[in-house]
């Protein structure tokens, strides 16, 4: 089975190092508890950028020190990653797990290629 997860192919981060994208998952029923994880893939290496669990009653809540923020609406999650620099350019995969009620489902998006360009330093003005 598995679950279909859709996310944009490419996103360009803002000059402030902020990138936003929507992660949408296909679910036949209404999941009471959902976990969303953003993974960064660099070659064969996979690292967790951030993760959050939300319920029908509660809004999506990342840890206070997380680089991510987000909101949820039905089967869509609006994700924002902050503090990005040029070296963070890469493929960001949205992983969705329907934790409750049974059955458990996991779904992986194909990844969003986030391009980050460091801003040019402002020239000194006399």
């Amino acid at each position: 089975k598995g679950m279909h997860v859709a996310q944009p192919a490419v996103v360009l981060a803002s000059s402030r190092g902020v990138a936003s994208f929507v992660c949408e998952y296909g679910s036949s029923g209404n999941a009471a508890e959902v976990r969303v994880t953003v993974l960064r893939q660099a070659g064969s290496q996979m690292t967790e950028v951030c993760a959050a669990t939300y319920t029908v009653e509660d809004e999506l809540a990342f840890l206070d020190d997380s680089t991510c923020t987000g909101t949820s609406s039905g089967n869509k999650v609006n994700l924002t990653i902050q503090g990005l620099r040029a070296m963070d350019t890469g493929l960001y995969i949205c992983k969705v797990e329907l934790m409750y009620p049974p059955p458990y489902y996991v779904g992986m998006g194909n990844g969003t290629q986030i391009y980050v360009i460091d801003p040019e330093p402002c020239p000194d003005s006399d």
């Epitope: 598995g2 679950m3 049974p102």
Partner: antibody, heavy 118, light 108 residues
Framework: QVQLVESGGGVVQPGRSLRLSCAAS????????MHWVRQAPGKGLEWVTF????????YYADSVKGRFTISRDNSKNTLYLQMNSLRAEDTAVYYC???????????WGQGTLVTVSS | EIVLTQSPGTLSLSPGERATLSCRAS???????LAWYQQKPGQAPRLLIY???SRATGIPDRFSGSGSGTDFTLTISRLEPEDFAVYYC?????????FGQGTKVEIK
């Protein structure tokens, strides 16, 4: 490096209980879901049970539902399997396994043998 | 529950030959959620392939996976002596997690 080490196996009589442990090291334990998988002598792999990151969500195979309980202590980096009302058909090597980022079981312990016999 | 059926049960081949193992699912499995494992006697299973065709870290390129929907294949292009073992397919997209019954690759 990632390591999973099971312990607690042994010989036990039918109807009795046993508790298995799986000590994890080399990774952030709380960031991964975990499983127990068993293998009866000369047989294939059978998934037994799953536990979520925080331990709030648990799933069981029908064959062990109501008898086995999975739990975890993230502060001790340890996974547990409490096995009650053991039967002869529960005789197997029990493996703990980590769920990789993309879903497959990427690391396994060496296994611990549980023999249920009178 | 998704039932996985592997064939053949046993494959008798010589080193250097090509091995083709089949895994058929009772219902569609997204290709992102199909894995292959290798198990040698007295050892724990080892992840070979995930997402139907991606090799796990450290797995030699003679191992390859293919397929989608309900039919999946593990191919070992040229069997090395250390490849003789039992191979299991697994679906991990939904609970309950299920394994095939295994295919034993033995020396002819």
């Amino acid at each position: 490096q990632v390591q999973l080490v099971e312990s607690g196996g042994g010989v036990v009589q039918p109807g009795r209980s046993l508790r298995l442990s799986c000590a994890a090291s080399g990774f952030t334990f709380s960031s991964y879901t975990m499983h127990w998988v068993r293998q009866a002598p000369g047989k294939g792999l059978e998934w037994v049970t799953f536990i979520s990151y925080d331990g709030n969500n648990k799933y069981y195979a029908d064959s062990v539902k109501g008898r086995f309980t999975i739990s975890r202590d993230n502060s001790k980096n340890t996974l547990y399997l409490q096995m009650n009302s053991l039967r002869a058909e529960d005789t197997a090597v029990y493996y703990c396994a980590r769920t990789g980022w993309l879903g497959p079981f990427d690391y396994w312990g060496q296994g611990t043998l549980v023999t249920v016999s009178s | 529950e998704i039932v996985l059926t592997q064939s053949p049960g046993t494959l008798s081949l010589s080193p250097g030959e090509r091995a083709t193992l089949s895994c058929r699912a009772s219902q569609s499995v997204g290709s992102s959620y199909l894995a292959w494992y290798q198990q040698k006697p007295g050892q724990a299973p080892r992840l070979l392939i995930y997402g139907a065709f991606s090799r796990a870290t450290g797995i030699p390129d003679r191992f390859s996976g293919s397929g989608s929907g309900t039919d999946f294949t593990l191919t070992i292009s040229r069997l090395e002596p250390e490849d003789f073992a039992v191979y299991y397919c697994q679906q991990y997209g939904s609970s309950p997690w299920t394994f095939g019954q295994g295919t034993k690759v033995e020396i002819k």
